[in-house]
């Protein structure tokens, strides 16, 4: 599914006409508030279904989210579906309306909830009150669906200023019925470490106020205990850790630490684990296959990436040619290592606009005090091919001699045709290939010379014809893996006093 | 692609009528939107009019209100402005745009443009 304009997020004028369209594989279609407004459905000739919404004489009640989905979706792979969000900022219209059992929230657990206050203004401050309080709560406020948290059983209203006018919403009542599962999240500082590194890991508990913990871990089962020390987290009402903390951690403490939580009242329990490995020192390795040999083609820009696992964060070099690298303040090379879990990095190299000079031996070393890694590849700039002469001359022996010169990497193919016809060539009749050894008309004389500087290949081709009785055209093509390049000549019979 | 080619243009005295076309090729036209947008030298591109894709919504420059018609063929592939009552002030190149994604009276909005035909209102 394609949406245009696509968003996901547009603010758009009031009074004014707006167009959205979404297109896709099958027929389309726009939802609104779970309803399909007015809309234009086409399909065009290359087989793509469109449809397009028209909202006009936009109000701040056109605020809201937009769906573009499949209209039959049964027949496809994926429920894809496309969200857009429009704010249409209208002073007239403070809180947007909400259904009435929007306006009563029920819970059975403990759990997150929203307070679905949205107006039509992304620019707006908007506050969570208490009905009976002026104290702002802190709440985190997202303009597209309200205030989200965890709320106590109260009434709830939501203030903005609009102008110099101060407007509130209807009030939000919250209800909970009663208090359910546990919720439990385990993590560790690390889950790699060194031996003689501390092993700490935190359970915690969200919206109970009684609850016993129970660990398990390696040490346990070898009878040497460790005491949890449990708290409570005074900024987060009822959120209770607790943390078991190993210091100097050896070999045998690598594997999976589980912490159980019960609470009596209800007998509700819930467990989370969590896997730590104890490493005899540190390491670095490579993972995945980096060619030996890398190319780059002349001007392009070109990335280059080594993906490792190393503990603990190594440092990263890269050298070309045994010198060290670094970020060139011209913005021809950029180098980065990026973290992409705990222990894994990507380390990236990118020359941009690659110039001839950057061909060589690049390596890339990641070290620490403990281990050390090194990959290294040839990068061979690749030069499109062009032919840069293509003369024709007739020396005393009689024959007609073509020559032909070019350059570029790797290193070119060359490619002789002759077409007879001038009137029908190239477009009726195909040319003929020449310079086959079993051809007694032309023979062929190639030499090749790799320029040490340039780090290209040059490609001297001379053709001899034996006999030309009427006008032909000579064509000389340049091939190599990153393009080719022709050039062509009338050859005329010696008897013919001009020449084309 | 879409390519636009607009015709019709052409010098009229004040008060009298043109029909600009514009017809498209290259994808299926029932899909986008069309619009004529005018220019004067060396002033910006302005709205005109414009037509949704089955011709349910036509919108129009106040200005052009009431002596301006907007209208459509998706067999033909064409969209057409009927432009009576002409004044001096319409002088102007007028460009055919197609497929709006956005608000419907800024030029940005438009993906595809014709080269524009040229009206002459003279007094």
């Known amino acids: 599914l394609v949406v245009t304009p696509p968003g996901p997020e547009l603010v758009l004028n009031v009074s004014s006409t707006f167009v959205l369209t979404c297109s896709g594989s099958a027929p389309v279609v726009w939802e609104r508030m779970s309803q399909e407004p007015p809309q234009e459905m086409a399909k065009a000739q290359d087989g793509t279904f469109s449809s397009v919404l028209t909202l006009t004489n936009l109000t701040g009640l056109d605020t809201g989210e937009y769906f573009c989905t499949h209209n039959d979706s049964r027949g496809l792979e994926t429920d894809e579906r496309k969200r857009l969000y429009i704010f249409v900022p209208d002073p007239t219209v403070g809180f947007l309306p909400n259904d009435a059992e929007e306006l009563f929230i029920f819970l059975t657990e403990i759990t997150e909830i929203t307070i679905p206050c949205r107006v039509t203004d992304p620019q707006l401050v908007v506050t969570l009150h208490e009905k009976k309080g002026d104290v702002a709560l802190p709440v985190p406020y997202d303009h597209q669906r309200g205030f989200s948290g965890i709320f106590e059983d109260r009434s709830y209203i939501c203030k903005t200023t609009i102008g110099d006018r101060e407007v509130d919403s209807d009030a939000y009542y919250v209800y909970r019925l009663q208090v359910s599962s546990i919720n439990v999240s385990v993590n560790a500082v690390q889950t790699v470490v060194r031996q003689g590194e501390n092993i700490t890991l935190m359970c915690i508990v969200i919206g109970n106020e009684v609850v016993n913990f129970e660990w398990t871990y390696p040490r346990k089962e070898s009878g040497r205990l460790v005491e949890p020390v449990t708290d409570f987290l005074l900024d987060m009402p009822y959120h209770i850790r607790s943390i078991l903390h190993i210091p100097s951690a050896e070999l045998e403490d690598s594997g999976t630490y589980t912490c159980n939580v019960t609470e009596s009242v209800n007998d509700h329990q819930d467990e989370k684990a969590i896997n730590i490995t104890v490493v005899e020192s540190g390491y670095v390795r490579l993972l995945g296959e980096v060619g030996t040999l890398q190319f780059a083609e002349l001007h392009r820009s070109r990335t280059l990436q080594v993906v490792f696992e190393a503990y603990p964060p190594p440092t990263v070099l890269w050298f070309k040619d045994n010198r060290t690298l670094g970020d060139s303040s011209a913005g021809e090379i950029a180098l980065s290592t990026r973290n992409v879990s705990e222990t894994r990095y990507v380390s990236e190299l990118t020359l941009v606009r690659v110039k001839v000079a950057e061909a060589g031996h690049y390596t890339m070393r990641a070290f620490h005090e403990d281990a050390e890694v090194q990959l290294s590849f040839q990068l061979q700039i690749n030069v499109p091919v062009r032919v840069l002469e293509l003369s024709e001359s007739h020396p005393d022996s009689g024959e007609q001699t073509v020559r032909c010169r070019g350059r570029g990497m790797p290193q070119p193919n060359i490619i002789w045709s002759a077409c007879r016809d001038l009137k029908r060539c190239p477009r009726e009749l195909p040319p003929t290939l020449l310079g086959n050894s079993s051809e007694e008309e032309s023979q062929l004389e190639t030499n090749v010379t790799y320029w040490e500087e340039e780090q290209e290949f040059e490609v001297v081709s001379t053709l001899r014809l034996q006999h030309v009785d009427r006008p032909l055209s000579v064509r000389c093509t340049l091939r190599n893996a990153v393009g080719q390049d022709t050039q062509e000549v009338i050859v005329v019979p010696h008897s013919l006093p001009f020449k084309v | 692609e879409v390519q636009l080619v607009e015709s019709g243009g052409g010098l009229v005295q004040a008060g009298g009528s043109l029909r600009l076309s514009c017809a498209a090729s290259g994808r299926a036209f029932g899909g986008p939107y069309m619009a004529w947008f005018r220019q004067t030298p060396g002033k910006g591109r302005e709205f005109v009019a414009a037509i949704s894709p089955s011709s349910v919504y036509t919108f129009y420059q106040d200005s052009v209100k009431g002596r301006f018609t907007i209208s459509r063929d998706n067999t033909k592939n064409t969209a057409y402005l009927q432009m009576n009552s002409l004044k001096p002030e319409d002088t102007a190149v007028y460009y055919c745009?197609?497929?709006?994604?956005?608000?419907?009276?800024?030029?940005?909005?438009?993906?595809?443009w014709g080269q524009g035909t040229q009206v002459t209102v003279s007094s």
């Open positions: 745009a197609a497929e709006a994604a956005g608000e419907v009276r800024l030029e940005t909005s438009y993906k595809y």
